[in-house]
Structures are given as structure tokens and as C-alpha cells.
């Protein structure tokens, strides 16, 4: 049961972190216009990884699109391609798991299959986690690094007494949205895969051995292996019905993995 | 078709207050930038206050500030200009004007007069 | 505040003939988000209210003839009436719509020579 809820809570809120993701990567606030300590004007800038936008206080905004791909900083493109890797690596990952719950049944999928898939998305949705808070802390590190360098000559100066004001970019709420949706997608995965270690079933399978005492014919069975499948005890805790009609094929499929003297 | 129609406008004692009402029509009213600009007799025009689309910030210059209060009631799709310590330099005509591109003001009322005399 | 600074102060121009009015800002008007220079220009005739011309400093309003023009950037503007018509006497003005306060320069009046 533990183990179910683990991977089920553990999918939900990889689901939610990947959401997070794809929506920070299509977000316009990656950097947005500071507005502390700077001349009031009446538009505010701010940028995302595809576009950059204006909205002026008249009511009017406008964005325009990066329509140049050689013509963008290198560490742009890095930052566009650690999030579309993100996403890719965490819809996969999502694909994979909806397969790998326990709750949903697939054929004859065995339990070590299902364990080995559960631990798959989980490592993907690390990766993507990782890739995503990759991707957005380098985005940050750029602005931290241009604030201060646009800082140190916020005002050039032009022709004597002309002034023209530098504008200065901060984090936008991308940033965070990417920071937070990395963190849930990285223990999603995280979630995922310590509940693979609850499915997995163990690699030995005590095999049951007759034992012929005189005038009896007793087939012991040892058990007490609760990581054991199959034998003893455990055979119990065994969910193998998972409730409602089952056809002739599908229970068929699951004694191949018990041992029957 | 975009209407601004200004009233409210009238003689008023120095130290006075006045309230200017703008009842615009033709076009989404909440969307929009809206502003106050004034016009002295045979002189030139001046900025009095905008009032941001959407998030409804509010600007105004220093020869006003803290006098003057610019409000929208959207559902009414009125602009008001309160105007409190009225001075004899306050005397003008008052434009309302509804922004667009470039924070420019393509559509403008007739206007009201506001002349502050004692 | 931003000082806007029109040049001349009134402009006596034959029918037909070019008519150029020039404003110059303390400061750049230039928006480094979308590369716009955020000034206006507007045309104000007696017992009238404004009327916006140009704005962005060169994108001519609709239903604004075309010899009207705005050209400029940065704090260095102009406003050019290519051939001059009887009906654009009136008082021009220039307006930074970049920083609070949006000042307006002083105007420039426009007469026939």
C-alpha cells in the first residue's frame, strides 16, 4: 500500500513540476525591467527565452519574437536547450510511469517490469529536474552578472548634458516558476524511485522442497521471506486480483512466478 | 465611435475643490490608458495625470502631486480628476484623453473650464 | 523632469513649400525593450483640442496625411510637413511619452508665409 501511494504521490507531483516546466519555459517574465531606483517610465520591459514584450501604461503591450537563431547569446541557447530538454526527458518519463503504476494493470505485466519502469521515469524525471534548475540558475546567473555590469554604468553619458538611461533587467517570475517546478519534478523522481525498491521483487526464489517422513507425505514450505514472492506468509500480502472480472489468460499469467510442489 | 465627454468644470475660490468627470463610450474602457492634460489661456498644453490600463497606477507631476487624485470607476467607464487647494495658476482648460501606442493620446474630449478666482 | 526643447518658436512657411519642426529631449526617449523612441508629436488648432499626429516619432497616426512625418531618435527630433496646406496652420507640439512626468514642449506655431 505504502509503496502504491509512494508511486502514485510520486507521479502526481513529477506531473505537476513537469507542468511547471513546459509553462516557465513559455513564460515572457524571465527577466523583467527593474524598477527600483530608476527613473519612472511609463513602459516596463521584460523578456523571456523566446520573445521579448512592452507593456506601456496606456494599456498597450508588444511583443516581438527572437526570429534570429545565430544572431542570440550562446548561453540563451543553452538555457532554451536544457529546458526543451527537461520537458522532452519529463514527458517521457510521464509516459513511461503511467505504465509503471501499480494501480494500473497492463497484460501480463510482472511486478520487475513494472519496478524496473518505475525506476526509469524516475531517474527521467531527475534528469529533467536537474536540467530545469540547470537552466534556469544559468538564466539567473546571466541577469545577476548584466545587472551588475549595467549597474556600474547605469547612466552614459551623451554629448555633455544629454543622459540616456540603461535599462536594468531582475529575475521574473519564470525564474522562480522554473525553480520550484525543477524541485517538484526532481522529487517526484526521487519518490519514484524509492517506491521501485518496494516493487522489486527479490532475486531468490526459495524453491519448495518435499520432505518424506515415514507414514506422513508433508510438503513444507518455508516462509518468513517477506521480500520473498510467492512463498509462505507472503503470498498473502499478494495482491494478484486487483478486483473485477479477470479473463481466463490474465490469470493464467500469474502463477508462472510461484513455485507449486 | 470613441466619446470623451469632460464636465464638472467651473468658477471655484483658491483653496477650493472641484471634482471633473469623463464619461467615455465607443471602446473597452478598463483596457485603456486615461489621462488629464490642461491648457492655460493662450498657453501651452500640460500633463496633469494618467492613470495606467489594467493595473490602474496612477502618475502625476510635481505642480499637482498630493493635490490633485485621478480615479476610475470601470463599471461606470468614468474617469474623475479630484481636485483639492485649488490655486490661481490651476486655472485652465481640462482635456481628458484616452492613450494607445506609444503611451500617445489619440482621442481627446472637448474639454471642460476650471477657472480658479477669488 | 525631462525638458522638451521645440525649435522655433513660431515658423512662417509658403503654400507648398517644406515646413520643418524640430524638439530635442534631455534625455534619450529611446526604449531598449523594443528599440522605440517614445515621443509624440500633436497639431492644435484654435478652440480645438489636440490632435495626434505622430507617434513612436515616426508612425503616422491613421487618417493623418502622408506629408506629415516624424523622424528622429534619441533625444533629436523632427516633425516635416513635406508641402504645405492652408489647413495645417496651427500650434505644434512635441510630447516625451517615455518618462513621468510626460512633458510637452513649448509649441511651435505655423503660419503662412
Known amino acids: 500500500m505504502a509503496v502504491t501511494a509512494c508511486q502514485g504521490l510520486g507521479f502526481v507531483v513529477s506531473l505537476i513540476g513537469i507542468a511547471g516546466i513546459i509553462a516557465a519555459t513559455c513564460m515572457d517574465q524571465w527577466s523583467t525591467q527593474d524598477l527600483y531606483n530608476n527613473p519612472v517610465t511609463a513602459v516596463f520591459n521584460y523578456q523571456g527565452l523566446w520573445r521579448s514584450c512592452v507593456r506601456e501604461s496606456s494599456g498597450f503591450t508588444e511583443c516581438r519574437g527572437y526570429f534570429t537563431l545565430l544572431g542570440l547569446p550562446a548561453m540563451l541557447q543553452a538555457v532554451r536547450a536544457l529546458m526543451i530538454v527537461g520537458i522532452v526527458l519529463g514527458a517521457i518519463g510521464l509516459l513511461v510511469s503511467i505504465f509503471a503504476l501499480k494501480c494500473i494493470r497492463i497484460g501480463s505485466m510482472e511486478d520487475s517490469a513494472k519496478a524496473n519502469m518505475t525506476l526509469t521515469s524516475g531517474i527521467m524525471f531527475i534528469v529533467s529536474g536537474l536540467c530545469a534548475i540547470a537552466g534556469v540558475s544559468v538564466f539567473a546567473n546571466m541577469l545577476v552578472t548584466n545587472f551588475w555590469m549595467s549597474t556600474a554604468n547605469m547612466y552614459t553619458g551623451m554629448g555633455g548634458m544629454v543622459q540616456t538611461v540603461q535599462t536594468r533587467y531582475t529575475f521574473g517570475a519564470a525564474l522562480f516558476v522554473g525553480w520550484v517546478a525543477g524541485g517538484l519534478t526532481l522529487i517526484g523522481g526521487v519518490m519514484m524511485c524509492i517506491a521501485c525498491r518496494g516493487l522489486a521483487p527479490e532475486e531468490t526464489n526459495y524453491k519448495a522442497v518435499s520432505y518424506h517422513a515415514s507414514g506422513h507425505s508433508v510438503a513444507y514450505k518455508p516462509g518468513g521471506f517477506k521480500a520473498s514472492t510467492g512463498f509462505g506468509s507472503n503470498t498473502k500480502n499478494k495482491k494478484i486480483y486487483d478486483g473485477g472480472a479477470r479473463t481466463e489468460d490474465e490469470v493464467q499469467s500469474y502463477p508462472s512466478k510461484h513455485d507449486y510442489v | 465611435e470613441v466619446q470623451l465627454v469632460e464636465s464638472g468644470g467651473g468658477l471655484v475660490k483658491p483653496g477650493g475643490s472641484l471634482r471633473l468627470s469623463c464619461a467615455a463610450s465607443g471602446f473597452t474602457f478598463s483596457s485603456y490608458g486615461m489621462s488629464w492634460v490642461r491648457q492655460a489661456p493662450g498657453k501651452g498644453l500640460e500633463w496633469v495625470s494618467t492613470i495606467s490600463g489594467g493595473d490602474s497606477y496612477t502618475y502625476y507631476p510635481d505642480s499637482v502631486k498630493g493635490r490633485f487624485t485621478i480615479s476610475r470607476d470601470n463599471a461606470k467607464n468614468s474617469l474623475y480628476l479630484q481636485m483639492n487647494s485649488l490655486r490661481a495658476e490651476d486655472t485652465a482648460v481640462y482635456y481628458c484623453?484616452?492613450?494607445?501606442?506609444?503611451?500617445?493620446?489619440?482621442?481627446w474630449g472637448q474639454g471642460t473650464l476650471v477657472t480658479v478666482s477669488s | 523632469d525631462i525638458v522638451m526643447t521645440q525649435s522655433p518658436d513660431s515658423l512662417a512657411v509658403s503654400l507648398g513649400e517644406r515646413a520643418t519642426i524640430n524638439c530635442k529631449s534631455s534625455q534619450s526617449l529611446l526604449n531598449s525593450g523594443n528599440q522605440r523612441n517614445y515621443l509624440t508629436w500633436y497639431q492644435q488648432k484654435p478652440g480645438q483640442p489636440p490632435k495626434l499626429l505622430i507617434y513612436w516619432a515616426s508612425t503616422r497616426e491613421s487618417g493623418v496625411p502622408d506629408r506629415f512625418s516624424g523622424s528622429g531618435s534619441g533625444t533629436d527630433f523632427t516633425l516635416t510637413i513635406s508641402s504645405l496646406q492652408a489647413e495645417d496652420v496651427a500650434v505644434y507640439y512635441c510630447?516625451?511619452?517615455?518618462?513621468?512626468?510626460?512633458?510637452f514642449g513649448q509649441g511651435t506655431k505655423l503660419e503662412i508665409k
Open positions: 510630447q516625451n511619452n517615455y518618462f513621468y512626468p510626460f512633458t
Open positions: 484623453a484616452r492613450s494607445y501606442n506609444g503611451n500617445s493620446l489619440p482621442y
